[in-house]
């Protein structure tokens, strides 16, 4: 008789990342009988929702349903129908919604309420929509990359099955850059974490981890740009802002109402004698870098050492995975290679920012101008944040690995979030069991 393949015993999970600039839906899959093993969960799909982040729907909440429809229907297609009812769905909103909540708790609740009602209409096991804390965002990003890198596995291997593996169990730090916030998370070396708000204790797979994390709200790349513009327009003599962070020849009109709409620019707000101003790019990396540094207050530190704005930061330790916008921006600029030194990155940025806007548009004809125009700022911001903000040096730069995916799964907080909420990371090391029938060759 012919052997008939048994139906694969798998499970699925869905996490929506409701970020400040967009929403992405991730579908994860894992073998049901290996739930507690490390590294078995992998991403099978990413669906990027067309449009901006959910906080933008504050005046049009009744459109959230149609906005989410295509990606939720995609999930319905990808996951077998027999699994729909047992597939958990989680939505986590990050800094865009944290900012909206700062402005109005009522409006943020209304947006989340409509999101919940929309997601409840699908045949999955909807588990709720919530705004996650910056601390959670940092922690889950750290869990994700170390889970995917096999750092929680107790088995030592003589060969490497994942990139960046140094064959030791030393965890990677996590550097996450979004549109509205940025997170830094790592295990410091024998250092007490001086501020309790930045300390996390985990027991994972039988091992204790003392983790440092901080999320800098308003220091994501989009909000940092708004901050810089609000700071610089204060000292502009008229409604022309000559800006070194944009290419020579670039021009753009900005509404003052848009500039002051975000809580991130409140500290720079002033009454201006105009409703609009024009950015005129002058494309100078060094001046752009200097302007960005003014966003970081390094004059005050109540601890032994700080990042900026009086926030404790222990000495950096080990390797770091830099993902999300750290990766997307550096990938666009072709600066993700392990071989590119920090000095080389700076040189390339100087050249890139100095290129005339007309030339840039011709070279990258397929890229939306809004995004294209901001790579000079974003690249310069990344360098400023990593070097002056987090105190990486030319030497320690080689410990930063710009990571998009690990083993086919996106680096980011969503996988760690799902692993935690589905109880798939045990505190203790699971006991080894004899081979199951499915393991026989």
């Amino acid at each position: 008789t012919q052997n008939k393949a048994l139906p694969e015993n798998v499970k699925y999970g869905i996490v929506l990342d409701a970020g400040s600039s967009h929403t992405s839906l991730y579908i994860y899959k894992w073998p049901a009988e290996k739930e507690n093993d490390t590294g078995v969960v992998h991403q099978v799909e990413e669906c990027r929702v067309k449009g901006p982040g959910i906080s933008k729907f504050v005046q049009k909440v009744n459109e959230i349903g149609i906005y989410l429809t295509d990606c939720m229907e995609r999930a319905r297609e990808v996951i077998p129908r027999s699994q729909h009812q047992e597939t958990p769905v989680y939505l986590g909103a990050t800094a865009g919604m944290r900012l909206l909540r700062m402005e109005s708790e009522e409006l943020a609740d209304r947006v989340l309420d409509v999101v919940e009602r929309s997601l409840s209409n699908y045949p999955f096991d909807f588990q709720g929509a919530r705004i996650i804390t910056g601390q959670e965002e940092g922690a889950y990003g750290w869990i994700t990359i170390n889970y995917l890198l096999g750092k929680f596995s107790q088995k030592t291997r003589w060969f490497s099955i994942v990139p960046y593996e140094t064959n030791n169990q030393e965890t990677f730090g996590a550097l996450d850059l979004g549109g509205a916030s940025t997170q830094v998370t790592f295990v410091p070396q024998n250092q007490t974490i001086e501020s309790p708000d930045n300390a996390l204790q985990f027991r994972l797979y039988g091992k204790d981890y003392n983790v440092y994390t901080h999320s800098f709200l308003c220091y994501g790349k989009d909000q940092a740009l708004w901050q810089k513009l609000a700071k610089d327009i204060q000292v502009a003599s008229n409604e022309i802002l000559r800006d070194p962070c944009f290419h020579p020849g670039y021009k753009k009109v900005v509404n003052v109402s848009d500039l002051y709409k975000t809580p991130c620019t409140k500290r720079f707000e002033m009454t201006l004698p105009f409703q609009q101003f024009e950015i005129q790019g002058i494309g100078n990396y060094q001046q752009c870098h200097q302007s960005i540094l003014e966003l970081f207050n390094t004059s005050y530190c109540p601890y032994s050492q700080c990042a900026f704005n009086g926030i404790f930061l222990p000495p950096l330790q080990g390797d770091f995975g830099a993902f999300s916008a750290f990766y997307f921006v550096m990938k666009f600029l072709n600066l993700t290679s392990e071989k590119v030194s920090q000095e080389k990155v700076t040189e390339m940025m100087k050249k890139f920012c100095a290129q005339p806007w007309e030339e840039i548009k011709t070279s990258y004809a397929g890229v939306k101008e809004k995004y294209l125009s901001e790579y000079c700022f974003s690249g310069t911001y990344i360098l400023s944040l990593l070097l002056q903000g987090y105190h990486f040096t030319a030497d320690s730069w080689e410990h930063i690995h710009f990571i998009g995916k690990i083993q086919g799964s996106d680096a980011g907080w969503t996988l760690g979030y799902m692993l935690n909420l589905t109880n798939m990371i045990p505190a203790e090391q699971p006991l080894s069991t004899p081979l199951s029938h499915s393991t026989y060759v």
Partner: nanobody, 124 residues
Framework: EVQLLESGGGLVQPGRSLRLSCAAS????????MGWYRQAPGNERELVAA???????NYADSVKGRFTISRDNSKNTVYLQMNSLKPEDTAVYYC??????????????????WGQGTQVTVSS
Amino acid sequence: EVQLLESGGGLVQPGRSLRLSCAASGDIFSINYMGWYRQAPGNERELVAAITGRGNTNYADSVKGRFTISRDNSKNTVYLQMNSLKPEDTAVYYCNAWDYSDYDEGPLREYDYWGQGTQVTVSS
């Protein structure tokens, strides 16, 4: 520019059906979403039903199970089949075609086109 022309409105008795049509012409490649809004006297304009370029649909709770939106891409037309009509469905129905902006500044919608509206009256 996109032009939208609605048809199919009228006076109908409660419990009966109507089918609205909206023909789109012009630069419609930039449009991902099409839908129907309605506005009763003294009320705000509300989204009734919408459909994406991939044919996925979404409905207001008040019309779920009674109204069906569909799209014929070959004819650049969107339809709203309205069954089991109630007096509270009385309103001017507007066809809308739009796409969202990806940006955190400026308006939510990058493209936003409206028809002139067609009156639907449900009365015995």
